[in-house]
Interface confidence: low
């Protein structure tokens, strides 16, 4: 048999809180347990679900959980079924609602001296206790002119008068908690003695020294009083005006007139209406002084013909908002067409050259008018006045290539040489009119040149080929003074170029013919074996038909090249002793000898008392010091050639003789001893 060990029991529960209906069974075989609510099976949800054989509630719901719950145990094998005792919840709850008009049927029917009933739609279990409020102040039962029916949840006002006007709200509390009305009710019962607005003053914007009018009217029985105040609560009447409102007039109908308005009159004006009963009604209006700021200067604009462009006129700040319009040549622009105004923009569609000129943006309001000009230039594509021509330019002379164009604005001209931009330097100069000047034409200037003339509207270009007319010249010019080594073979070259290949020949300056051992081979003078007589002046002559001839004079010297008879040797000297570095050279012309020590030439006139250079070329250094150590170079030179040889000088301390060494022991290295 199935036995219930624990049965569900009825219990109190709180709306939205947890709860548990317990059920435990014992049976000989397996049973399954399910729950019934008012006889219907309970389906599991996230809120309400079986927990073992008990039924768990995550949040009790007064609507879904009202009724009788029963736990059922069933043995599916035997078909035996057992049901628990019934259990239900006593759910405690409270729920907010609005304050509504119960009587009369509509707000339109509310009149002074009628009964008005309001209902508080807050409900709950157990039944809550109600509290009413007017404008946030609690109303207690039994107060004059109203009754509160807690059972009916009603507030009755009998008779209702203007003093009952206000915002009605209610709150209710019970064992479960508290709630206040979700929507309140405004009761408005007119009182003829209260001031009511007939005409409210409006904000006014006026120009300086103009007049301003504020209208203000109230009605009541008996008629209300009216008072004007300015900013700092200063009253304005026809009898007592504040110093800064001397030109203020208050009319019988309540209107306020201000004449010759000045900046100090701007501000907030308050119109106050006071009935025999009820609160004062305060209406505000502001007097603004019209103003308009200056407009800053426009940047000039450059446009291209055929394009569409817009120029925006940023309106100046002003009160009231300034109106903006564009003019050209004194005529206001239309709102459509080819050149027109759109909003604050000047629009130029399919721009023509004739559109160039000054356009004016105007802005105006009560405070005045502002204007600003914009200068519009219509750029045109350059046209040719003179294109660059294929040209023959003479080498060594200035050359010119024209590139003359016209356009608006003035075109910019750039030149290219072999597709490379020419930057102005000492050789190239571009004149203001576009002409290119090559200051000194060189052979390699013979190539293609291209000029490009541009404006924002576009560019044109043309090219020309330059042919350089080469001048007759030596390439390179022969050295005017040359040396040949005696008894050796020698050559003296001479070459030249010109528009036609020149003929080159050598002759002696005195006109005498060349000896038979000297040959002139295509401009190269060849000496098979140089003799003393070969020295002298020679002339190289280059000539061609169109350019005539040029001459180069060469003085040839015959020399015996320098050799060293004596060369300086590696030398080590004791400190304080004398060093001798020998050097002798021979050659013709007789060579002169110079010494270089420590990377500087030793000037014989500035050697000082310790150093001396002998006539044969040897160098003597007395009283040597460690700083004299280093490499010394003997340089021999004459008008034909120069040779040098070098040797190191070491300066060392004199060793102190040891006892083991005999007095005749030699030093450990080669020495000069003095």
């Amino acid at each position: 048999a199935i036995v219930f060990i624990k049965q569900p029991s009825s219990q109190d529960a709180l709306q939205g809180r947890r709860a548990l209906l317990r059920c435990e069974v014992e049976a000989p075989g397996p049973v399954h347990v399910y729950w019934l609510l008012d006889g219907a099976p309970v389906q599991d949800t996230e809120r309400r679900f079986a927990q073992g054989s008990s039924l768990s509630f995550a949040a009790v719901d007064r609507l879904q959980d009202s009724g009788t719950f029963q736990c059922v145990a069933r043995d599916d094998v035997t078909g035996e079924e057992a049901r628990s005792a019934n259990a239900s919840f006593n759910i405690k709850w409270i729920e907010a609602g609005p304050v509504v008009l119960k009587h009369p049927a509509s707000e339109a029917e509310i009149q002074p001296q009628t009964q008005v009933t309001l209902r508080c739609h807050i409900d709950g279990h157990p039944r809550p206790t109600y509290q009413w409020f007017r404008d946030g102040t609690p109303l207690s039962d039994g107060q004059s002119n109203h009754t509160v029916s807690s059972k009916e949840r009603n507030l009755t006002l009998r008779p209702a008068g203007p003093e009952h006007s206000g915002l009605y709200s209610c709150c209710a509390h019970s064992a479960f908690g508290q709630a206040c009305s979700s929507q309140n009710f405004t009761l408005s019962i007119a009182d003829e003695s209260f001031a009511r607005v007939v005409l409210a003053p409006q904000d006014v914007v006026v120009a300086r020294y103009e007049e301003a009018m504020f209208h203000c009217q109230f009605s009541a029985q008996p008629p209300p009083s009216l008072q004007w105040l300015f900013e700092d609560e200063t009253p304005i009447t026809n009898r007592s005006r504040p110093p800064h409102l001397r030109r203020a007039t208050v009319f019988a109908n309540g209107s306020l007139l201000l004449t010759q308005v000045r900046p100090r009159n701007a501000g907030i004006y308050r119109c106050i209406g006071q009935g025999q009963r009820g609160p004062p009604i305060i209406l505000e209006a502001t007097l603004h002084l019209a103003e308009i700021e200056d407009m800053p200067l426009f940047e000039p604009r450059v446009f291209t013909a055929g394009s569409e462009e817009r120029v925006t006129c940023l309106p100046p700040k002003g009160l009231p908002e300034p109106s903006v319009w564009w003019e050209h040549a004194g005529v206001r622009l239309p709102t459509h067409g080819r050149v027109y105004q759109k909003g604050h923009e000047l629009v130029l569609a399919n721009i023509a050259e004739s559109d160039a000129g000054v356009y004016t943006c105007h802005a105006a309001n009560l405070a005045g008018q502002r204007r600003q000009d914009v200068n519009i230039t219509v750029a045109t594509v350059p046209s040719w006045l003179k294109k660059p021509q294929d040209s023959q330019l003479e080498e060594g002379k200035p050359g010119y290539l024209d590139c003359l164009t016209q356009a608006t604005p003035k075109p910019t001209v750039v030149w290219y040489r072999n597709q490379m931009l020419i930057s102005e330097d000492s050789r190239f100069e571009v004149f203001k009119n576009g002409t290119l000047r090559i200051n000194s034409v060189e052979v390699y200037d013979g190539t293609w040149y291209r000029c490009m003339s541009s404006t924002p509207a576009g560019s044109i270009e043309a090219q020309a080929r330059v042919q350089v007319l080469e001048k007759l010249k030596f390439t390179p010019p022969p050295q005017p003074q040359q040396c040949m080594e005696f008894d050796k073979e020698a050559t003296v070259p001479c070459s030249a170029t010109g528009r036609e290949k020149p003929t080159i020949k050598w002759e002696r300056a005195d006109g005498s013919s060349l000896p038979e051992w000297v040959t002139d081979n295509a401009g190269t003078l060849h000496f098979a074996r140089v003799t003393r007589d070969d020295a002298g002046n020679y002339t190289c002559i280059a000539s061609n038909g169109p350019q005539g001839q040029i001459r180069a004079h060469v003085q040839l010297t015959v020399a015996v090249f320098i050799t060293f008879k004596v060369e300086p040797e590696r030398t080590t000297v004791y400190q304080g002793h004398t060093a001798l570095l020998q050097c002798e050279a021979q050659g013709d012309p007789k060579p002169l000898i110079q010494w270089k020590g420590k990377d500087r030439i030793l000037d014989p006139t500035k050697l000082g008392p310790r150093m001396h250079i002998f006539q044969n070329g040897s160098l003597v250094i007395h009283d040597v010091a460690p700083e004299d150590s280093g490499r010394y170079t003997c340089i021999a030179g004459n008008s034909c050639n120069i040779k040098h040889t070098e040797a190191p000088l070491y300066v060392v301390d004199k060793p102190v003789p040891e006892e083991s060494e005999g007095p005749g022991s030699p030093p450990p290295y080669k020495m000069i001893q003095t």
């Epitope: 800053p296 940023l314 604005p409 003035k410 404006t455």
Partner: antibody, heavy 120, light 113 residues
Framework: QVQLQESGPGLVKPSQTLSLTCTVS??????????WSWIRQHPGKGLEWIGY???????YYTPSLKSRITISVDTSENQFSLKLNSVTAADTAVYYC????????????WGKGTTVTVSS | DIVMTQSPDSLAVSLGERATIDCKSS????????????LAWYQQKPGQPPKLIIY???TRESGVPDRFSGSGSGTDFTLTITSLQAEDVAIYYC?????????FGGGTKVEIK
């Protein structure tokens, strides 16, 4: 790099006309986009703007000098000029030419200035 | 005309210290529609023309050291040299370019203390 160079006589006699020229180099004077100004500085004093010209010839002169002043332009020579009539000792000053950028009228390039003395 | 008033007339500041120059315009030079202040600052050394250092009240001209800065709006502006160097000794001028005639301040001479 645009450069400006003022030129003109350093000494002018009273009641005569002061004439100065400003040569613009290193840039295209007539490509638009700049106003070309004259400014002067009396000895030991501050700067006084005289007027400007656009390459197309549009001018604006400071009101105090308007009756005596003419600013003109020669686009072919990349030059603009200042003429000031009926000079007095009060016109003795260093005169500068300058470039004002794109209608925003701050002077971003100045000439070195030339001293003009009005004396008999 | 818009009158530009600079203060002080002269200013002596130690090397490495901050120098501050004020400039007041008689009219607003802030244009509300683009929120730009039409004001520039120039530096003039003896025997030289003025050199533009700040425009739009706070934008540094290229090549001007970042120790120079401009601030302010409407009618009140300031030029600040945060750490004065010997080469900053000069007269400084403000200039409005809101409307013609263009007008300059009277100048402020900055010296080393």
């Amino acid at each position: 790099q645009v450069q400006l160079q003022e030129s003109g006589p350093g000494l002018v006699k009273p009641s005569q006309t002061l004439s100065l020229t400003c040569t613009v180099s290193g840039g295209s004077f007539s490509s638009g986009g700049y106003y070309w100004s004259w400014i002067r500085q009396h000895p030991g004093k501050g700067l006084e703007w005289i007027g400007y010209i656009y390459y197309s010839g549009t001018t604006y002169y400071t009101p105090s000098l308007k009756s005596r002043i003419t600013i003109s332009v020669d686009t072919s020579e990349n030059q603009f000029s200042l003429k000031l009539n009926s000079v007095t000792a009060a016109d003795t000053a260093v005169y500068y030419c300058a470039r004002a950028g794109f209608g925003y009228y701050y002077m971003d390039v100045w000439g070195k200035g030339t001293t003009v003395t009005v004396s008999s | 005309d818009i009158v530009m008033t600079q203060s002080p007339d002269s200013l002596a500041v130690s090397l490495g210290e901050r120098a501050t120059i004020d400039c007041k315009s008689s009219q607003n030079v802030l244009y509300s529609s683009n929120n730009k202040n039409y004001l520039a600052w120039y530096q003039q050394k003896p025997g030289q023309p003025p050199k533009l250092i700040i425009y739009w009240a706070s934008t540094r001209e290229s090549g001007v050291p970042d120790r120079f800065s401009g601030s302010g709006s409407g009618t009140d502006f300031t030029l600040t040299i945060t750490s004065l160097q010997a080469e900053d000794v000069a007269i400084y001028y403000c200039q409005q370019y809101y409307s013609t005639p263009l007008t300059f301040g009277g100048g402020t001479k900055v010296e080393i203390k």
